[in-house]
Interface confidence: low
């Protein structure tokens, strides 16, 4: 077990923050509930701050909880390739860019570490080139989440992880909004960290809303598992 | 921008970048430069909130990014000039923090004119 697992063995609160901008249209975002890494689930739910959220929720789904795969569930064959809980407590830096087909990009940096006993995600967001009437700026995506892989490799060179994955947002029309999504990992402290065989986390989400909640929001369900890598001959054997 | 001129390798020159329009003290200052038929990189950038400073490698120990609230300006000052530093100085400015590692031009708003630095052998 790394020394940051040790940190995720029970139920631990999240905190997250969000300033963004996406073609001149700023906006923040706060975050709270829990994770819990036994079970690779999360509870969190979002308030715009600062009124209406000019994008679509789901479009901030990866920036918010698929920021803090930390909680992820990696069975004890995979517990070694688990660099997210690893870089723990000092936290990780995480990079994306994310093109929307067809219209604009967002580019994301984020803060995921803790700050007393809580794992605090504190993200930058900017988007640019969005069609004022397409798929994002028009909020035409419906309120819900697909079930997705993503794909995780090391990054030796920076001591962290690269991932790669492919979202689908589902259109009011039937059809499909794509985003490809380029990550990067890197520890913010110079303890070690573990560095992966290659692996994917399968995600499933859930997006409903608060009855009660009057301002603009998302309540967020979701599990997540690593998967991709056998067990060795020697466990086959024993 | 001012500061910028003709210096030998081994000089120092101070960069200045005073916003108007802009209030420095919170969000993110940076400087980026361009030499000739290259790409625009990112040189320094600063959290005007807390402080926090970032590098690129190739400038790490010789420059010093700073900021001055009161003035509303932002300083590079570069010391140990190279032949390899002579470019195009721009300075940007964003409303939000910075990017860890200077990826992005997208990520500034506004932009100034730049500002010409020749480093001769």
């Known amino acids: 077990m790394s020394k940051g697992e040790e940190l995720f063995t029970g139920v631990v609160p999240i905190l997250v923050e969000l300033d963004g901008d996406v073609n001149g249209h700023k906006f923040s975002v706060s975050g709270e509930g829990e994770g819990d890494a036994t079970y690779g689930k999360l509870t969190l739910k979002f308030i715009c701050t600062t009124g209406k959220l000019p994008v679509p929720w789901p479009t901030l789904v990866t920036t918010f909880s698929y920021g803090v795969q930390c909680f992820s569930r990696y069975p004890d064959h995979m517990k070694q390739h688990d660099f997210f809980k690893s870089a723990m407590p000092e936290g990780y830096v995480q990079e994306r860019t994310i093109f929307f087909k067809d219209d604009g990009n967002y580019k994301t940096r984020a803060e995921v570490k803790f700050e007393g006993d809580t794992l605090v995600n504190r993200i930058e967001l900017k988007g640019i080139d969005f069609k004022e009437d397409g798929n994002i700026l028009g909020h035409k995506l419906e309120y819900n989440y697909n079930s997705h892989n993503v794909y995780i490799m090391a990054d030796k060179q920076k001591n962290g992880i690269k991932v790669n994955f492919k979202i689908r947002h589902n259109i009011e029309d039937g059809s499909v909004q794509l985003a490809d999504h380029y990550q990067q990992n890197t520890p913010i402290g110079d303890g070690p960290v573990l560095l992966p065989d290659n692996h994917y986390l399968s995600t499933q989400s859930a997006l409903s809303k608060d009855p009660n909640e009057k301002r603009d929001h998302m309540v967020l369900l979701e599990f997540v598992t690593a998967a991709g890598i056998t067990h060795g001959m020697d466990e086959l054997y024993k | 921008e001012s500061g910028g001129g003709s210096v030998q390798a081994g000089g120092s020159l101070r960069l200045s970048c005073a916003a108007s329009g802009y209030t420095v003290s919170r969000g993110c200052m940076a400087w980026f430069r361009q030499a000739p038929g290259k790409e625009r990189e990112g040189v320094a950038a600063i959290n005007s909130g807390d402080g926090t400073t970032y590098y690129a490698d190739s400038v790490k120990g010789r420059f010093t990014i700073s900021q001055d609230n009161a003035k509303n300006t932002v300083y590079l000052q570069m010391n140990s000039l190279e032949p390899e530093d002579t470019s195009i100085y721009y300075c940007?400015?964003?409303?939000?923090?910075?990017?860890?590692?200077?990826?992005?031009?997208?990520?500034?708003?506004?932009w100034g004119q730049g500002t010409q630095v020749t480093v001769s052998s």
């Open positions: 940007a400015a964003s409303r939000l923090r910075c990017p860890w590692n200077l990826v992005s031009a997208s990520w500034y708003d506004f």
